[in-house]
Interface confidence: low
């Protein structure tokens, strides 16, 4: 019993003055608490608590369930306790069958004894099965049996508390150990889509999946750089013992442009945190942006092929695409396809395949595309390079020799005189007149050039060469001169 020092509050005293008391079932329990400032008796066993404001606690007919700790408290908050065992051969254990252990922590099998004098107080496996080899425990008759450092492998382990009574083993009711796993890794988080593009008024909904060993994992959707609480809905599942999954769905029923931004799904447990983000872009209306993959001015040689290629971004999805030339729509020779098979793809490719182009097929080729909100177009100017063709070569009545040639780019015409019958003409002759005939005509056709020289300058037999050339090639025509006396007898043009 505590000693009393004058002037200093002391704990109450209890009669009988011992720390433990053993009574037989059916006997009376009579406990007296002596203290000038008595407040209450408290009885505790397992999770049950009872209070009594009388300074004498009397239980006329004791039962096994009256086993427990009786504490007397005074007004100074000081207390004293006695532990009472009510020995009942028919009920050796008081039991709270709930048994939950946190991994790596100790947990108590709550089977306190009603008789402290029984022997070999220990744990046994159900149906004679042995306990796990590494399971260590410490028995305490007043509290139960403490399992040290619970392992995840002990989950759903079936146990009995056991004692020996009169040479026989007596088992308690069975306990099933449920292990609450410790977090040994950060949660695994994933998001249904990494980015979203929406028009104003459309619904934004994104789901974050959080996986961990137990439901104690914390998760939330956050808007980056904002403290606003977001509205989420949850679904959760236990797939087996240590495989928990939660789906947190964030919804904005009618998205606005200022809802655009980065949303983070954040999860943490006692081990650490993990996060994943998704980007929302809300536009006030749809759009189409076209990007030519080649120069919009194209030069191609006669008879060659060319591919006109565009990439374009379209949101919402493109509905109509066409290629047009000279007010005619192509029904074939082109293809249109998404740049990626990704669900959130907004980029597309369109290709027009022009084969064996003729000189007459230059011009403006236009790609048009539209969706439910906008139209867009891009034009390619295609120039077909052609070797010059000499259209006419004549002696005019005024004595002029005239050569007319067509090609693209614009041909140049040079004149040469060859004495005698040679056709390797070297001496150049300056033209009297050079004209480009169709500069005011269509911009993509062949360009026609006319050049003239004065034939009176030639005094000897010979050949005059008209040579038309450009970057693609050259073509020549020839005029033959023959003199009889002082007269030019004849001029024979030939190529």
């Amino acid at each position: 019993q505590p000693s009393v020092s004058p002037g200093e509050p002391s704990p109450p005293s209890i009669h009988p003055g011992k720390s433990d008391l053993i009574v037989r079932v059916g006997d009376e329990i009579r406990l007296l608490c002596t203290d000038p400032g008595f407040v209450k008796w408290t009885f505790e066993i397992l999770d049950e608590t009872n209070e009594n404001k009388q300074n004498e606690w009397i239980t006329e007919k004791a039962e096994a369930t009256n086993t427990g700790k009786y504490t007397c408290t005074n007004k100074h908050g000081l207390s004293n306790s006695i532990y009472v065992f009510v020995r009942d051969p028919a009920k050796l254990f008081l039991v709270d069958r709930s048994l939950y252990g946190k991994e790596d922590n100790d947990t108590l099998v709550r089977c306190p004894l009603t008789d402290p004098e029984v022997t070999n107080y220990s744990l046994k496996g159900c149906q004679g099965k042995p306990l796990p080899k590494d399971l260590r425990f410490i028995p305490d008759p007043k509290a139960g049996i403490m399992i040290k450092s619970v392992k995840r492998a002990y989950h759903r382990l079936c146990l009995h508390c056991s004692v020996d009574q009169e040479g026989k083993s007596v088992l308690s009711e069975k306990f099933i150990l449920k292990v609450r796993p410790a977090f040994k890794a950060v949660p695994v988080v994933s998001v249904s889509k990494a980015s979203y593009l929406l028009r104003e008024g459309e619904e934004f909904t994104v789901t974050c999946t959080i996986k961990d060993v137990s439901s104690s994992v914390y998760s939330t959707w956050k808007r980056e750089n904002s403290q606003t609480k977001l509205q989420e809905k949850y679904n959760s599942w236990h797939h087996g013992d240590f495989n928990y999954e939660r789906q947190a769905t964030l919804t904005i029923s009618s998205a606005r442009v200022n809802d655009s931004g980065v949303f983070m799904c954040y999860a943490n447990n006692t081990f650490g945190s993990a996060n994943v983000t998704t980007t929302l872009e809300v536009v006030d209306k749809g759009f189409i942006n076209i990007f030519p993959m080649i120069n919009t001015t194209v030069f191609v040689n006669d008879g060659e092929n060319v591919d006109l290629i565009v990439e374009y971004e379209a949101f919402p999805k493109p509905e109509h695409q066409q290629w047009i030339y000279m007010n005619r729509t192509f029904t074939d020779k082109w293809e249109d396809y998404p740049k990626s098979e990704n669900e959130s793809n907004i980029r597309y490719v369109s290709e027009l395949h022009l084969t064996r182009l003729k000189g007459t097929e230059g011009g403006t080729y236009t790609f048009l595309v539209s969706n439910s909100d906008v139209n867009a177009a891009i034009a390619f100017n295609v120039y077909v390079n052609t070797k010059p063709e000499i259209l006419t070569y004549d002696r005019l009545v005024n004595g002029m020799l005239q050569c007319v040639a067509a090609g693209f780019p614009e041909p140049t015409i040079d004149w040469y005189f060859c004495p005698g019958t040679e056709q390797r003409c070297s001496a150049s002759v300056l033209p009297v007149d050079v004209q480009t005939l169709n500069s005011s005509g269509p911009p993509f056709g062949k360009l026609v050039v006319q050049s003239s020289i004065d034939s009176s300058a030639f005094k000897h037999n010979g050949t005059v060469e008209c040579k038309a050339y450009n970057d693609v090639g050259k073509t020549s025509a020839y005029f033959n001169f023959a003199f009889k006396g002082n007269n030019k007898e004849q001029i024979h043009p030939h190529t």
């Epitope: 999770d47 049950e48 608590t49 709930s98 939950y100 439901s215 949850y234 959760s236 236990h238």
Partner: antibody
Framework: QVQLVQSGAAVKKPGESLKISCKGS????????IGWVRQMPGKGLEWMGI????????RYSPSFQGQVTISAGKSISTAYLQWSSLKASDTAMYYC????????????????WGQGTMVTVSS | AIQLTQSPSSLSASVGDRVTITCRAS??????LAWYQQKPGKAPKLLIY???SLESGVPSRFSGSGSGTDFTLTISSLQPEDFATYYC?????????FGGGTKVEIK
Amino acid sequence: QVQLVQSGAAVKKPGESLKISCKGSGYRFTSYWIGWVRQMPGKGLEWMGIIYPGDSDTRYSPSFQGQVTISAGKSISTAYLQWSSLKASDTAMYYCARHGRGYNGYEGAFDIWGQGTMVTVSS
Amino acid sequence: AIQLTQSPSSLSASVGDRVTITCRASQGISSALAWYQQKPGKAPKLLIYDASSLESGVPSRFSGSGSGTDFTLTISSLQPEDFATYYCQQVNSYPLTFGGGTKVEIK
């Protein structure tokens, strides 16, 4: 003995607020989850949510998330269910119940029930 | 959320009859199922927890069985005080849903 005692019946108008209580005794209040269950007239039981008074860990049914708030005062062994703006459809009997000790509140069962609080919302 | 479907929704029986009520879960819930009895104007009362464990003080004529998705509550010999509504509840994962109830009436 172990018991839960709920506050008395309440008659309210739509839009008003209300907080009903559930007081536990005869056991260690902080060691057990306390759940709330709704029963509309002539209908079945609906699980609303649950709180662990020891640390105020709270879980809600998606149907009731944002509609009600569950809280607890552990020093006075009392759990609460509150509405900030009542609707006529909130008219029902509300029960609190102790959830037998469980790993994260998943196991065990409602072993002790309060007597129920009738909430009537009418204009 | 896990759905619980109780059948039948109501039944008529006589004193002494054997009565069986079933509860089916939309996904596996191991043995995490409880059964309750509710009489008019009263709070529900726990009968069975862990699918088959009889709550203290509940008469032994009540028994529960099943695991996974299919569960049964059996009253071996119906007594006058057993006429009531019976509910199952899953306690495997949030939200902790109830079945729709089975009303046992006097034939």
